[in-house]
């Protein structure tokens, strides 16, 4: 009987993740007597909500709760009924209710309000809903990945977690990309970060950390498109707008309404003598990267160096886990291998970009046609970004790693969300953890 | 804690321009919008335009359309209105305000005399 | 351009007393189920401050006794009990379209 586990003495936790196209929501799991532990906390289970994201319901509030449902019912299920009354759960708004907010205060607190109110109906203990900063979500991305990579922990293992894991204690630096920001945030290597809101100082585990780290709104992927769409169509001399960023052959009809819809948009608006516009494909990665630079201000740094649109960067330093619409990009072009150099890449993006728009249907006849269509444009932005927004190079690409989940935990800013709001990550080292009944001495 | 500073008085002459500032602190400065409203008489009030400081856009009320210009510098977190070709009329004071929709913060306001 | 009308434009109130001010616009200021008015108080030398948005939610720090009703085209702002402190300009204001538009603004006294 000395080696039988007693029952789990176990904790869950809830985050849902209301990003600008969809929310998704996890449940985290973790021993009650090991809550200080570093990487004790796993995610136990994931559930993407069914629909877009929460900022799309202003028209339509009433029908948050039923969009909200079958995920909640899920996490009921996975949950012991026992349990149900201590698993905290967090809602937390991205970009896409920033966005949303920047319009109007009253239709953010409004679909927050009636978030609140649905989520409020669950037997868990909702600890409300609110939109997080862009600092925020870069801290807490960044949180994640180091946590989950054991690089918080004291103890040095001889063993690897994963395959790009580095044997020590350097952090990773994070790299999100979201539908309608991106973020980056990393430890500088001795350099002062001259921009007071790109500063954070963190203590965790007995040891202190300088971290940078920036979002840029209106950058995420969905976002980038709107403004290089109504940036190209200020020029064309007609309601045709011939663009590199899709395949040959490929039309679609824009509403000129929805393409200023957003604030992401504002700087290029103007009259336009018509109400549509037909984007036709022409499927040049070149011409198309070309085009996404044009979204970078480069003119203006008044720091020692920039990203772009005058905001400090400092000088890369270490090992990137790139994840979220990073990660998923380049996994559906099959990019993510840690042997593909930055010009394999480039060269698969322009062979992937010139195939004809009948040949890519045919080949992904599983794939909805709205997001395989822009598959083309958001791995030539991703290039864009990292290489000219955030200054990678051929050598330094090699230092980016396209991370979906580590340890059966996806990448993201949830779970260093989480531990932050349950105190699960002390500012000082514990002195000592006792061993789980469920350890074989 | 939000606050909005503006620059102070400016005495200008008719005919001329003036650009008064409004510095921003205590939030994401890129995360709203920033509002401009003229009140003359310490009774009337009347909406400018606003600019994003995220991007540089900016609306108008059409009556100030043409004769008044908003900037924004996002490093010092600083918004800007110029106003041009200025009468008698433009002596008022002028507020920025934080908001989207709602003008929940507004700086002290910059007291603009129009006189030769 | 929306028009809001204020009334009364000066209004004396005794201490203790309810004061109501109205506003009316002159087409909806209604949009997604939320009213976008806003009633602002202003003293001599100081900016607007909010007291009222979404035309019946109270600002941040706003005593109880300011209240805010209406919808469509028909608001009010109600102070009850009337204080010495409250003496000062009032103004209604929209925001439901461009050009934003305020009220003429209401002067308000302790009788």
């Known amino acids: 009987t000395q080696n039988k586990a007693l029952p789990e003495n176990v904790k869950y936790g809830i985050v849902l993740d209301a990003g600008s196209s969809h929310t998704s929501l996890y449940i985290y799991k973790w021993p009650a007597e090991k809550e200080n532990d570093t990487g004790v906390v796993h995610q136990s289970a994931e559930c993407r909500v069914k629909g877009p994201g929460i900022s799309k319901f202003v028209q339509k509030v009433n029908e948050i709760g039923i969009y909200l449902t079958d995920c909640m019912e899920a996490a009921r299920e996975a949950i012991p009924r026992s349990q149900h009354q201590e698993t905290p759960v967090y809602l937390g708004a991205t970009a896409g209710m920033r966005l949303l907010r920047m319009e109007s205060e009253e239709l953010a607190d409004r679909v927050l309000d009636v978030v609140e109110r649905s989520l409020s109906n669950y037997p868990f203990d909702f600890q409300g809903a609110r939109i997080i900063t862009g600092q925020e979500e870069g801290a807490y991305g960044w949180i994640t990945i180091n946590y989950l990579l054991g690089k918080f922990s004291q103890k040095t293992r001889w063993f690897s977690i994963v395959p790009y894991e580095t044997n020590n204690q350097e952090t990773f630096g994070a790299l999100d990309l979201g539908g309608a920001s991106t973020q980056v945030t990393f430890v500088p290597q001795n350099q002062t970060i001259e921009s007071p809101d790109n500063a954070l100082q963190f203590r965790l585990y007995g040891k202190d950390y300088n971290v940078y780290t920036h979002s840029f709104l209106c950058y995420g992927k969905d976002q980038a498109l709107w403004q290089k769409l109504a940036k190209d169509i200020q020029v064309a001399s007609n309601e045709i707008l011939r663009d590199p960023c899709f395949h040959p052959g490929y039309k679609k009809v824009v509403n000129v309404s929805d393409l200023y819809k957003t604030p992401c948009t504002k700087r290029f608006e103007m009259t336009l003598p018509f109400q549509q516009f037909e984007i036709q494909g022409i499927g040049n990665y070149q011409q198309c990267h070309q085009s996404i630079l044009e979204l970078f201000n480069t003119s203006y740094c008044p720091y020692s160096q920039c990203a772009f649109n005058g905001i400090f960067l400092p000088p890369l330093q270490g090992d990137f886990g790139a994840f979220s619409a990073f990660y998923f990009v380049m996994k559906f072009l099959n990019l993510t291998s840690e042997k593909v150099s930055q010009e394999k890449v480039t060269e698969m993006m322009k062979k992937f970009c010139a195939q004809p728009w009948e040949e890519i249907k045919t080949s992904y006849a599983g794939v909805k046609e709205k997001y395989l269509s822009e598959y083309c444009f958001s791995g030539t932005y991703i290039l864009s970004l990292l290489l000219q927004g955030y200054h990678f190079t051929a050598d330094s690409w090699e230092h980016i790693h396209f991370i979906g989940k580590i340890q059966g935990s996806d990448a993201g800013w949830t779970l260093g969300y989480m531990l932050n709001l349950t105190n699960m990550i002390p500012a000082e080292q514990p002195l000592s953890t006792p061993l789980s009944h469920s350890t074989y001495v | 804690e939000v606050q909005l500073q503006q620059s102070g008085p400016e005495l200008v002459k008719p005919g001329a321009s003036v650009k008064m500032s409004c510095k921003a602190s205590?939030?994401?400065?890129?995360?709203?919008?920033m509002h401009w409203v003229k009140q003359s008489h310490g009774r009337t009030l009347e909406w400018i335009g606003y600019?994003?400081?995220?991007?540089?856009?900016?609306t108008f009320n059409q009556k100030f359309k043409g004769r008044a210009t908003l900037t924004v510098n996002t490093s010092s977190r600083t918004a800007y209105m110029e106003l041009r070709s200025l009468t008698s009329e433009d002596s008022a004071a002028y507020y920025c305000?934080?908001?989207?929709?709602?003008?929940?913060?507004w700086g002290q306001g910059t007291l603009v005399t129009v006189s030769a | 351009d929306i028009v809001l009308t204020q009334s009364p434009a000066s209004l004396a109130v005794s201490l203790g007393q309810r004061a109501t001010i109205s506003c009316r616009a002159s087409?909806?200021?209604?949009?997604?189920?939320?009213?976008?008015m806003y009633w602002f108080q202003q003293k001599p030398g100081q900016p607007p401050n909010l007291l009222i948005y979404?035309?019946?939610n109270q600002g941040s720090g706003v005593p109880a006794r300011f209240r805010g009703s209406g919808s469509g085209t028909d608001f009010s702002l109600n102070i009850h009990p009337m204080e010495a402190d409250d003496t000062a300009m009032y103004f209604c204001?929209?925001?439901?379209?461009?050009?934003?538009?305020f009220g003429g603004g209401t002067k308000l006294e302790i009788k």
């Open positions: 305000a934080r908001g989207g929709t709602r003008f929940a913060y």
């Open positions: 205590g939030y994401t400065f890129t995360d709203y919008n």
């Open positions: 600019i994003v400081p995220l991007n540089g856009g900016s």
């Open positions: 087409e909806s200021v209604d949009n997604f189920g939320v009213s976008f």
């Open positions: 979404g035309a019946s």
């Open positions: 204001q929209q925001t439901k379209e461009v050009p934003y538009t």
